[in-house]
């Protein structure tokens, strides 16, 4: 190997990372010029832009699939971007129906062939953009990795690309003889990578002697509000849950200028920027008479984009609960039901690009995801407190009010690319 390559400044020709197999859609869903109707932001690689749009398509469909299997009172939080990135690691070594299903479920078949063939390179570019922001006021930390049984010999090229693009080689572990020790090792690695924020990503007994390959992806975000909430204005107030019950939440308050719009059927959309302006939190709050489930059902990337495009800066009063959501789950059954069947099947999986001996019995035993978000007066995740001098609660009856005292959707996005980094719902901010 020569000198190490910086993936963030590299050109595609600098890194030969052609996948073992390539996918061609029979319907040719994507064309080279697709997506040109929407203006690509300045200083943005059009292929990274395409990938970001594919991620948004996956984000909304996966969220809907997951939400359908949750109780309406359950909080949900996930990083569709992190999930897509992790599964793109398996795409690099996938062939046949396994590859086709990865392409379809993750919406990679909606992007041009040139982008999808070099998807790892463009994922790396997208991640460079998100994880290497010059602005030090926000922090995005992810830990994505494949862990395989040590009896396998892994393809060296796969290992090199995995390290270069995704920041981690596939790690061999002794699942057969030391399943519980392996679980502890994975959880420790994730904990270290996320500075102790995310622990126990793999639940007990999720790994056994039959485990072959485990995919783990975890992520957390820490950001400071551009305009902080004053703790003196926080009050205990009732939050009305989907089941008609209420609970006592710590409701933060501030008046200020924010991008806001009341859209179809009285749904309110508010954007709260984090310091640096590149990353924002978008809140979607249905009117009291409309259930959040209905909004979730109608949600598409196009609807979301339309709403974001309509936002206008205005003075308003914001009431928003403090909350902490930690959500972790196995992705296996959700993705199998969505059509990603072969990857998890010992009989059908085709991952020849991952192992050295060309074995065709390699499959993913399970995949785990965990993300967490804490929102308070300072921003997301507790930060060192600084004095904030903000006026108290005024009684301006004419001011537009955004009062999140009932279930709402939350997105954290990178603005220029409109990449959905996180999405979820706050159905119960009172849970500790």
């Amino acid at each position: 190997h020569g000198s190490p390559v910086d993936i963030c400044t590299a050109k595609p020709r600098d890194i030969p990372m052609n996948p073992m197999c390539i996918y061609r859609s029979p319907e040719k869903k994507a064309t080279e010029d697709e997506g040109s109707e929407q203006k690509i932001p300045e200083a943005t690689n059009r292929r990274v832009w395409e990938l970001s749009k594919a991620n948004s398509r996956f984000a909304t469909t996966f969220y809907q699939h997951l939400a359908d299997s949750k109780n309406d009172n359950d909080n949900i939080f996930l990083s569709p971007l992190s999930i897509s990135t992790a599964f793109a690691m398996t795409k690099l070594g996938a062939c046949n129906d396994t590859l086709q299903q990865l392409m379809e479920v993750f919406k990679f078949d909606t992007i041009s062939e040139k982008t999808s063939d070099q998807i790892h390179f463009f994922f790396a570019k997208l991640n460079c953009r998100l994880y290497r922001k010059a602005n030090k006021s926000s922090k995005l930390v992810s830990a994505n990795r494949l862990f395989g049984d040590k009896s396998l010999t892994f393809n060296e090229t796969y290992q090199d690309i995995s390290e270069l693009v995704y920041g981690a080689k596939l790690q061999p572990l002794d699942f057969k003889e030391n399943a519980e020790q392996s679980r502890a090792a994975i959880n420790k690695w994730v904990s270290n990578k996320t500075e102790g924020r995310i622990t126990d990503v793999i639940p007990s007994e999720a790994i056994n002697e039959l485990t072959v390959l485990v995919l783990v992806n975890t992520i957390y975000f820490k950001g400071l509000w551009k305009s902080k909430f004053s703790p003196e204005n926080t009050r205990k107030e009732l939050f009305y849950k989907a089941d008609g019950e209420s609970c006592s939440a710590s409701m933060m308050y501030q008046e200020g200028k924010f991008r806001y719009r009341r859209v179809a059927e009285g749904t309110q959309v508010l954007e709260l920027p984090f310091k640096g302006d590149d990353i924002t939190m978008v809140l979607i709050l249905p009117k009291p008479e409309k259930s959040l489930a209905k909004v979730e059902k109608e949600l598409t990337p196009e609807v979301l984009q339309e709403w974001l495009d309509e936002l206008e800066e205005m003075m308003l009063v914001v009431h928003m609960p403090r909350f902490r959501i930690e959500d972790g789950f196995s992705l296996k059954e959700q993705l199998q039901d969505m059509g990603l069947v072969d990857l998890f099947s010992p009989e059908k999986s085709k991952l020849p690009g991952i192992v050295a001996e060309g074995r065709d019995d390699l499959y993913v035993s399970d995949a785990f995801h965990k993300a967490f978000l804490e929102v308070n007066e300072e921003g997301s995740e507790a930060a060192a407190s600084t004095a904030v001098v903000i006026a108290g609660r005024s009684l301006n009856p004419n001011r537009v009010t955004f009062k999140a005292n009932r279930p709402f959707l939350v997105f954290i996005r990178e603005v220029p690319l409109n990449t959905i980094i996180f999405m979820g719902r706050v159905a119960n901010p009172c849970v500790k």
Partner: nanobody, 114 residues
């Protein structure tokens, strides 16, 4: 891939009853929200009723008090009991997820005979 198989439709007199069944092959069936939809000739597909994993039900105003959605998790089956049928209930009835829809099944035809 999740397969959906609807059955139980047929010809029915005004005021009559039918019970529709839908077998779904989803691994996450028991925790998942399911729904019945219908499509009348020349009209858009519309939501008729839904049921969450916890058993909470919701109905379109036009069928409230007449239709009942239920589920049997042991059989991976969702039902729609249709009573007091009206001419406007004539349509192909489909079942699918509530928020997330899988590939649509063939549906089952419900026809009012007058």
């Amino acid at each position: 891939q999740v397969q959906l198989q609807e059955s139980g439709g047929g010809l029915v007199q005004p005021g009559g009853s039918l019970r529709l069944s839908c077998a779904a092959s989803a691994l996450t069936f028991s925790s998942r929200a399911w729904a019945w939809y219908r499509q009348a000739p020349g009209k858009q597909r519309e939501l008729v009723a839904s049921i969450t994993g916890g058993g909470t039900t919701n109905y379109a105003d036009s069928v409230k008090g007449r239709f009942t959605i239920s589920r049997d998790n042991a059989k991976n089956t969702v039902y729609l009991q249709m009573n007091s049928l009206k001419p406007e209930d004539t349509a192909v009835h489909y079942c699918n997820g509530y928020r997330y829809t899988y590939a649509w099944g063939q549906g089952t035809q419900v026809t009012q005979v007058t």
